[in-house]
């Protein structure tokens, strides 16, 4: 079997949802060492970066300018060190926002509800649209779809303290084209007394695992890395 | 804004060489990434050669060896030598650029530029 590298880690700097006409950063970490890393979109040659000194960095960052619909859609990255390549990293799914509208988010019964009542949100895109999308802040991986020509609802169920926060919505013209985000709607549960010191409050800041961990090796580094090489030697 | 105006083709006999020229107005030269494409009577747009703000460059297969690329930050103008020459290399020749870029990217995909000249047309034939 062909011989291939570990996989690279892909993640998207700050965001990957990115306004149009503003700048994605996409980091792609694999290995010290790495001569050349490339950008892969939709299955087609994006970018290449070819790193200097390559044994003193990890990774990569490859910008994205002037972001818009033509741009949006799936990355992913590899590497290659000496002649041999790594494996595919993980797709990573780009999204274009401030397209066209802005929706209007409306949550019912109100925005502020008790523990264990049923809440919905809909939200609202007179503009041709089919999909609407359902995001809460800080947590903006877990996205609810919901479909209707100009209104979807968001079924949320009885609710718990977890489900506090800002709400916010998008149209979507495809996977990949969203429209401006709604104004927020900020959900407040009460009850659960028991459990509200447990419920942390959502982050303002974007999520947290969007960021690009790429480090300079130092010297140090580069001799514990020896030694610890050295040493595995030995034991063996 | 940037302006990207393309110069230097022609028609030439198979075996030959070119160097096409991409004169770029404005004092975003230096921050842009630049690539040139090209364009065959009823094919595809597809990507020739690409060269990163620091000068590192990345070739097609179909021409590695045979076409070089180059820019003169002091000239604001980005070049593609071109020896060897096929009849297949006979096209519309566009010059394009990423503005503005970080880093070293050197940018293969069509839709990552977001400036285009109009073009120059190589002909190559006996």
């Known amino acids: 079997p062909k011989q291939t590298l570990p996989k690279p880690i892909i993640r998207a700097e700050s965001t990957y949802m990115v306004p149009k006409e503003k700048q994605a950063t996409l980091c792609c970490q694999g290995s010290y060492g790495a001569v050349e890393y490339q950008l892969h979109f939709e299955g087609s040659l994006f970018a290449v970066e070819r790193p200097k000194p390559p044994e003193r960095i990890n990774g990569v960052k490859f910008h994205i300018p002037d972001m818009n619909s033509r741009k949006a859609g799936r990355y992913s990255c590899i590497y290659r060190v000496g002649e041999l390549w790594s494996e595919r990293s993980d797709l990573l799914d780009l999204v274009v926002t401030e397209m066209y509208d802005t929706p209007t988010l409306s949550v019912h019964p109100g925005p502020e509800v008790t523990s264990g009542e049923k809440v919905t949100f809909y939200c609202r895109l007179d503009t041709a649209t089919s999909m609407f999308l359902l995001l809460k802040e800080g947590r903006s991986r877990d996205v609810q779809r919901s479909y209707g020509k100009v209104q979807a609802e968001f079924p949320m169920g009885p609710v718990t303290t977890a489900h506090r926060g800002s709400y916010r919505c998008f149209g979507s013209y495809n996977n990949y084209a969203w429209s401006f985000p709604s104004e927020p709607v900020k959900l407040l549960v009460t009850g659960d007394i028991e459990n509200t010191s447990l419920a942390p409050t959502d982050p303002t800041f974007p999520d947290s695992w969007d960021t690009c961990l790429l480090t300079r090796e130092t010297g140090l580094q580069k001799d514990l890395a020896l030694w610890d090489h050295t040493a595995q030697n030995l034991l063996r | 804004e940037v302006q990207l105006v393309e110069s230097g083709g022609g028609e030439v006999q198979p075996g030959g060489s070119l160097r096409l020229s991409c004169a770029a107005s404005?004092?975003?030269?230096?921050?842009?990434?630049m690539g040139w494409f090209r364009q065959a009577p009823g094919k595809e747009r597809e990507f020739v050669a690409a060269?990163?703000?620091?000068?590192?460059?990345y070739y097609a297969d179909s021409v590695k060896g045979r076409f070089t690329i180059s820019r003169d930050n002091a000239k604001n103008t980005v070049y593609l030598q071109m020896s060897s020459l096929r009849a297949e290399d006979t096209a519309v020749y566009y010059c394009?650029?990423?503005?503005?870029?970080?880093?070293?990217?050197?940018?293969?995909?069509?839709?990552?530029?977001?400036?285009w000249g109009q073009g120059t047309l190589v002909t190559v034939k006996p």
């Open positions: 394009a650029a990423v503005v503005p870029t970080y880093g070293n990217n050197i940018y293969v995909h069509s839709a990552a530029y977001n400036y």
């Open positions: 404005g004092r975003t030269f230096a921050s842009a990434a």
């Open positions: 060269i990163s703000r620091s000068g590192d460059t």
